[in-house]
């Protein structure tokens, strides 16, 4: 039968080494067997490269394309093929479609004056454009009470957050996760980091009296 794209490719770049495109077919498809995404940088002498997509769901395909350290001028020509049939053609400028890498190594440490110090790693090396552009969102939630959660925006440079233990329920187990975005690139949010969990053992001041 005829092969058709239901939702055309949507692509994002981590702006360092990888661009990912995702699209939906009009019926369940074996993406790696039936489809190919070709990509070519619009630059004199560039070669055509081929990405073999994988299934994310029955009819959703994903392709991860290795790219060079991106620069603003880069524009890729993308062509989606089913054998000899061209299903879709478009262009993609990584600098205009940034999805930052996920922050890593989120840890929680007890700190002075009844505070918790949350720390994580910037996912970009210092020489990358995005290293100094990231701001973060930290989500802290009570594992046993879905209503008890807080969101913190970290807009300063360091990948840290100080959290007063008194702002959390004593004796409760909390989880934190962090994600990043790059304001100057008008990026989307990164995926959330894996959660880290700790017990808030702060004793409210009233209990001392």
């Amino acid at each position: 039968g005829s092969v058709k794209v239901l939702h055309e490719p949507s692509c994002f770049s981590d702006y360092i080494s990888t661009s990912v495109c995702q699209w939906k077919m009009d019926h369940p498809t074996n993406c790696s067997a039936e489809l190919r995404l070709s990509y070519q940088l619009d630059f004199m002498g560039s070669e055509n490269h081929t990405c073999v997509p994988e299934n994310r769901e029955d009819s959703v395909c994903v392709c991860s394309m290795p790219i060079d350290d991106a620069v603003e001028a880069d524009v890729y020509q993308l062509d989606l093929w089913a054998g000899q049939q061209l299903l879709w053609s478009g262009s993609f400028q990584p600098s205009k479609h940034v999805k930052p890498r996920t922050p890593g190594n989120l840890t929680v440490h007890p700190n002075i004056s009844h505070t918790w110090l949350l720390m994580w790693t910037n996912p970009y090396p210092t020489e990358n454009h995005l290293h100094s552009e990231l701001t973060y969102m930290v989500n802290v939630s009570n594992d046993n009470d879905p209503e008890d959660f807080k969101v913190y925006n970290v807009t300063y440079m360091g990948p840290t957050l100080r959290l007063a233990a008194s702002t959390l329920k004593s004796g409760a187990s909390y989880s934190a996760r962090v994600r990043a975005w790059a304001q100057t690139y008008n990026s989307t949010w990164s995926d959330w980091s894996p959660s880290t969990t700790w017990l808030n053992y702060y004793e409210p001041w009233e209990q001392h009296l």
């Epitope: 940088l41 630059f43 004199m44 002498g45 560039s46 790219i67 001028a73």
Partner: antibody, heavy 125, light 112 residues
Framework: EVQLVESGGDLVKPGGSLRLSCVAS????????MTWVRQAPGKGLQWVSL????????YYADAVKGRFTISRDNAKNTLYLQMNSLRAEDTAVYYC??????????????????WGQGTLVTVSS | DIVMTQTPLSLSVSPGETASISCRSS???????????LDWYLQKPGQSPQGLIY???KRASGVPDRFSGSGSGTDFTLRISRVEANDTGVYYC?????????FGQGTKLEIK
């Protein structure tokens, strides 16, 4: 040692055809784009054509578009320039040169880093 | 098309002095920060051209540090310090950014 050796230059009548060859050695030929540059007697350098490493993409100067065809045989480490409908103004020494490395996603640029010795093409009746 | 304009077209310099050649392009040759697709070539009498500078400022292999390139965007300069008799020839700039590639008219350097 990286080396380029051109051949095929000759005296040919206007409207005639000629095929130039450039044999490469000392580097991984298929990884690099190749370029033809020409120089009319007593004149400056003029870019003619470029082909990427796989041969999948070609570029031409307006003066030769539709008349000249650049190609390559990576198995033989050889670059070609097929010249048809030759004109007096095509008279020049033709040089082949190694251009950018196109194996990477964004070609790595080193300028025209190796040149051949040139081959003379004379178009005259 | 990008037009390349060199000045001066000829230059006479005494040994040991510094020679400067300018090259201007009709469009910016900057692809990204630090990547200016402008080269300099020398053609000695009776020889094939040879690469001197690429990407505006990087010296080709084996080129002495007396040769230096600078500039960005549309304005570039080749400087040859402590000029020697062996430096005689015609110097060309070339843009390597987009098709059609293009050379300047050439600058003939003569050593007094």
């Amino acid at each position: 040692e990286v080396q380029l050796v051109e051949s095929g230059g000759d005296l040919v009548k206007p409207g005639g055809s000629l095929r130039l060859s450039c044999v490469a050695s000392g580097f991984t030929f298929r990884d690099y784009a190749m370029t033809w540059v020409r120089q009319a007697p007593g004149k400056g350098l003029q870019w003619v054509s470029l082909i990427n490493g796989s041969g999948g993409k070609t570029y031409y100067a307006d003066a030769v578009k539709g008349r000249f065809t650049i190609s390559r045989d990576n198995a033989k480490n050889t670059l070609y320039l097929q010249m048809n409908s030759l004109r007096a103004e095509d008279t020049a020494v033709y040089y082949c040169a190694v251009d950018r490395k196109t194996k990477t996603i964004r070609p790595q640029y080193y300028g025209l880093w190796v040149w051949g010795q040139g081959t003379l093409v004379t178009v005259s009746s | 098309d990008i037009v390349m304009t060199q000045t001066p077209l000829s230059l006479s310099v005494s040994p040991g002095e510094t020679a400067s050649i300018s090259c201007r392009s009709s469009q910016s040759l900057t692809y990204s920060i630090g990547y200016n697709y402008l080269d300099w070539y020398l053609q000695k009498p009776g020889q094939s051209p040879q690469g001197l500078i690429y990407l505006g400022h990087k010296r080709a292999s084996g080129v002495p540090d007396r040769f230096s390139g600078s500039g960005s965007g549309t304005d570039f300069t080749l400087r040859i310090s402590r000029v020697e008799a062996n430096d005689t020839g015609v110097y060309y700039c070339m843009q390597g950014l987009q098709s059609p590639l293009g050379f300047g008219q050439g600058t003939k350097l003569e050593i007094k």
